[in-house]
């Protein structure tokens, strides 16, 4: 068994949803390990995920310190076993990630309809305000806390008996819509950040229909 060369990581990719942020890369290591470093443009390079054989590193704890900052990561390849380092003068190989700005780029997670309540010909639909891993004063902030009015929700609703969809929008987590009395409706919501150029929309929430458990009905 001859020596092999240490190889640099490649395909460095940020995977981020509601600020839970993981850096992934290739290849699966053979006789080498990885250490990840993360930095803001003006900050120090902080080592994380030391000497790992994984090809991912959870960097959530670092990026939630300031989600509006732009981060850069790099993955070092260290020889571990019957290998030769291919870095110059004993310097380990490394590869840089693309830049990542959590506030602008984290994917919006699939929202959930928390409840709906019908009063006469009005229905109030409430979207669950999902907790993120962003902290302020030792408490976890919700998606709404972080994004404020930058975040809107789109409601899609339709009569159970037909396929024609209507839409409504809100910059809170609640909708108040008009419905026909005596008709059952189905609902789905989508999170949207209109000001974004990428990752503007979440996937649609699971569909909830009147006549099922989540609803309350009052004449």
């Amino acid at each position: 068994s001859g020596t092999t060369n240490t190889v640099a990581a490649y395909n460095l990719t940020w995977k981020s949803t509601n600020f839970k942020t993981i850096l992934e890369w290739e290849p699966k290591p053979v006789n080498q390990v990885y250490t990840v470093q993360i930095s803001t443009k003006s900050g120090d390079w902080k080592s994380k995920c030391f000497y790992t054989t994984d090809t991912e590193c959870d960097l959530t704890d670092e990026i939630v310190k300031d989600v509006k900052q732009t981060y850069l990561a790099r993955v070092f390849s260290y020889p571990a076993g019957n290998v030769e380092s291919t870095g110059s003068a004993g310097e380990p190989l490394y590869e840089n990630s693309p830049e990542f700005t959590p506030y602008l780029e984290t994917n919006l997670g699939q929202p959930t309809i928390q409840s709906f309540e019908q009063v006469g010909t009005k229905v109030n639909v409430t979207v669950e305000d999902e907790r993120t891993l962003v902290r302020r004063n030792n408490t976890f902030l919700s998606l709404r806390d972080v994004f404020g009015k930058d975040l809107i929700y789109t409601l899609y609703y339709w009569k159970s008996s037909s396929s024609g969809k209507k839409t409504a929008k809100t910059n809170t987590n609640e909708f108040l819509i008009d419905v026909d009395k005596g008709e059952n409706y189905c609902f789905s919501v989508q999170a949207v950040i209109p000001s974004r150029t990428v990752n503007r929309k979440s996937t649609d929430s699971p569909v909830e229909c009147m006549g099922q458990e989540k609803g309350e009905f009052r004449e």
Partner: antibody
């Protein structure tokens, strides 16, 4: 030239508090994790934990969780190891060591702590 | 935590003899270092990443192993090699050291 200079030997009584120091120079102090290693007389090495000076994040060996505290003062490029109530079993040589890859290897000269009534 | 067991604890060896020190881990390790420590001195990195010699370490030293079994070998012992050698794993927290092997010149 990278240097880690530790504070001098200490003799203490059980129950007393103590803070020993490790001053880094010749490099960007906030950029490197700092390890602390314990070596009891005539015994082997024991990794206590490490601290990242830029934000004071610590990784502590659970064995030392309620016994010792790691801290830093970035303004004077100094890392600290402290005890609020010393025991005889804390008698040891304590080393600080910069977390480095490969041949880069920087250790302080060690601080001897003796705890005796 | 990963427990590292070194053997032997002590070895008294004549110059030019081959020395083998083993380090056995309680679970699989992917990154192992070896340190040399002489009396009244701080430890020095000797071998890193299982088999890479630190700067200035003579080529008579070598490191090998994988999984749970690792070895430091001195091919032809010299007087200056008298010291205690420690293995250390950095694969999972808490990082741990072996108990050490003292090499003495006969």
């Amino acid at each position: 030239e990278v240097q880690l200079v530790q504070s001098g030997a200490e003799v203490k009584k059980p129950g007393e508090s103590l803070k020993i120091s490790c001053k880094g120079s010749g490099y960007s102090f906030t950029s490197y994790w700092m390890n602390w290693v314990k070596q009891m007389p005539g015994k082997g090495l024991e990794w206590m934990g490490m601290i990242y000076p830029a934000d004071s994040e610590t990784r502590l060996n659970q064995k030392f969780k309620d016994k010792a505290t790691l801290s830093v003062d970035k303004s004077i490029s100094t890392a600290y190891l402290q005890w609020s109530s010393l025991k005889a079993s804390d008698t040891a040589m304590y080393y600080c060591a910069r977390e480095d890859y490969g041949s880069s290897d920087y250790w302080g000269q060690g601080t001897t702590v003796t705890v005796s009534s | 935590e990963i427990v590292l067991t070194q053997s032997p604890d002590f070895q008294s060896v004549t110059p030019k003899e081959k020395v083998t020190i083993t380090c056995s881990a309680s679970s699989s390790v992917s990154y192992m270092n070896w340190y040399q420590q002489k009396p009244d001195q701080s430890p020095k990195i000797w071998i890193y990443g299982i088999s890479n010699l630190a700067s200035g370490v003579p080529s008579r030293f070598s490191g090998s192993g994988s999984g749970t079994d690792f070895t430091l070998t001195i091919n032809s012992l010299e007087a200056e090699d008298a010291a205690t050698y420690y293995c250390q794993q950095k694969s999972s927290f808490p990082w741990t050291f072996g108990g050490g092997t003292k090499v003495e010149i006969k």
